[in-house]
């Protein structure tokens, strides 16, 4: 298992400070940390040194050292705080994408551990969080919104109390994607149809999904029909409906009708047969 020097879990320095982190292992070692400026890397066999002579708030983060050749996959970590009185937050990403019911980590890292008691999460322009937003905070990692919901796809800011006033981070956009279990659900009504020539008929092709991104079409034999689509949203599902109205059916209307819907997960189709008789 590699060992990091300094041998502390946390290191707090001022902006402009010189910081040296050394990792020693049995074999070659590698550093991984937040993308930040001013670091110089020196490697020498089983040791590797990360060094900066001008630490900035952007160097705040967890630096992990691993030994790629270690079969046990051991690692060591140190968290660096560069406590800049003007910059309480180091935001590592401005867009976070998760699926519904996953935890969403908003990576705003506190640059000074002393400020932890006065942190909060808000939506941009100071708007409060949506009701039932369950979140926690870690100064090393940021805010975690637990079991994120689609409706929580918003722009957020991290807030810290400094000298009695709230200082905000830059905004972080959270995109919560619906978990699409499979292709859209389909209904084709009626299941079968017989009409006398000259009568009216109606065929309804309906598809629904938790996500709006899907296509639906009705085809007669092998011809895709151009039918206006009606869209709706209820019971947390998006619905798209195609209604074919025939005022006076004729023999050319007879045949196989297929309702087809597709999304990123695949395609569903269902068919019915329409018979037209003389009398």
């Amino acid at each position: 298992i590699p060992v990091i020097e300094p041998s502390v879990p946390e290191l707090v320095v001022k902006p402009g400070a010189t910081v040296t982190l050394r990792c020693v292992g049995n074999g070659s070692v590698e550093w991984d940390g937040p993308p930040s400026p001013h670091w110089t890397l020196y490697s020498d066999g089983s040791s590797s040194i990360l060094s900066t002579n001008n630490a900035t708030f952007q160097n705040t983060g967890t630096y992990r050292c691993t030994e790629p050749g270690d079969p046990l996959g051991g690692s060591a970590a140190i968290h660096l705080y560069v406590k800049d009185p003007a910059r309480p937050w180091n935001v590592l990403a401005q867009e976070v994408v998760v699926f519904e019911d996953q935890d969403a980590l908003l990576p705003c890292l506190l640059t000074d551990p002393v400020l932890e008691a006065g942190v909060s999460l808000v939506r941009v322009r100071g708007r409060p969080l949506m009701r039932h937003t369950n979140y926690s905070f870690s100064p090393w990692h940021g805010f975690t919104i637990h079991r994120a919901k689609f409706i929580q796809s918003q722009d957020y800011q991290c807030s810290a109390l400094m000298g009695g006033r709230k200082v905000m981070s830059i905004s972080i956009r959270l995109k919560v994607q619906k978990v699409i279990p499979g292709p859209p659900a389909l209904t084709l009504v009626p299941a079968e149809l017989v009409r006398i020539r000259g009568e009216a008929a109606q065929i309804v092709c309906s598809a629904s999904s938790v996500d709006v991104n899907f296509d639906v079409f009705l085809q007669h034999n092998n011809t895709k029909l151009a039918i206006p689509q009606q869209s709706d949203f209820h019971n947390n599902r998006y619905q798209k409906v195609l209604t074919l109205n025939l005022d006076q059916v004729d023999f050319q209307h007879a045949g196989n009708y297929s309702c087809v819907a597709s999304n990123v997960q695949g395609k569903h189709s269902t068919s019915m047969f329409f018979r037209v008789v003389e009398s």
Epitope: E10, A17, T18
Partner: antibody, heavy 118, light 107 residues
Framework: EVKLEESGGGLVQPGGSMKLSCAAS????????MDWVRQSPEMGLEWVAE??????????FYAESVKGRFTISRDDSKSSVYLQMNSLRPEDTGIYYC?????????WGQGTTLTVSS | DIQMTQSPASLSVSVGETVTITCRAS??????LAWYQQKQGKSPQLLVH???NLADGVPSRFSGSGSGTQYSLKINSLQSEDFGSYYC?????????FGGGTKLEIK
């Protein structure tokens, strides 16, 4: 409020054994690195042993003077750290402090006294 | 192992004076130095970490400086509560050795 409370000190004969305990509260113990430091008039403050967090594989480190004789361990479910001391010598006499490491030895217990004497 | 040499071993000063305690490491410790204060019969308390950073709640009359192998702790305008012993300690790897201490006494 961070609190560290040592126990288990006392009088022991040379060659004997003793186990010190430290009960912690007021912080997330499982994330913490914990150390033992001892103090005597002859040796001053002397670092003894360290055990790191689970994230750091519960790695242990020892002062050369105690290596092979002392064992540091922890029970995260009980928020406790222990120091098992075997083959004790008169020079192991002193006040043993339990400390939490963050940016330094941020928090110290009140200490427990070990006397090794015949 | 890194040795820490602290000086002076003792110091007799009056309230209101300024004192400086120094600590020398046997090799470069890259500013990974802590200072502790210990009052009679009490546990040590962290004063300074990473050579120059004051621990939470430490009065601003205390200041740490230094780099490489040479470090110092300065106390401006000594108060009566500042009397006691002071220790330096490095965090550049293990073993984490302490300095021998400086006893600050009232003149």
């Amino acid at each position: 409020e961070v609190k560290l409370e040592e126990s288990g000190g006392g009088l022991v004969q040379p060659g004997g054994s003793m186990k010190l305990s430290c009960a912690a509260s007021g912080f997330t113990f499982s994330d913490a690195w914990m150390d033992w430091v001892r103090q005597s008039p002859e040796m001053g403050l002397e670092w003894v042993a360290e055990i790191r967090s689970k994230a750091n594989n519960h790695a242990t480190f020892y002062a050369e003077s105690v290596k092979g004789r002392f064992t540091i361990s922890r029970d995260d479910s009980k928020s406790s750290v222990y120091l098992q001391m075997n083959s004790l010598r008169p020079e192991d006499t002193g006040i043993y402090y339990c400390t939490r490491v963050k940016v330094g030895f941020d928090n110290w217990g009140q200490g427990t006294t070990l006397t090794v004497s015949s | 192992d890194i040795q820490m040499t602290q000086s002076p071993a003792s110091l007799s000063v009056s309230v209101g004076e300024t004192v400086t305690i120094t600590c020398r490491a046997s090799e470069n410790i890259y500013s990974n130095l802590a200072w502790y204060q210990q009052k009679q019969g009490k546990s040590p308390q962290l004063l300074v970490h990473a050579a120059t950073n004051l621990a939470d709640g430490v009065p601003s009359r205390f200041s740490g400086s230094g780099s490489g192998t040479q470090y110092s702790l300065k106390i401006n305008s000594l108060q009566s509560e500042d009397f006691g012993s002071y220790y330096c300690q490095h965090f550049w790897g293990t073993p984490r050795t302490f300095g021998g201490g400086t006893k600050l006494e009232i003149k």
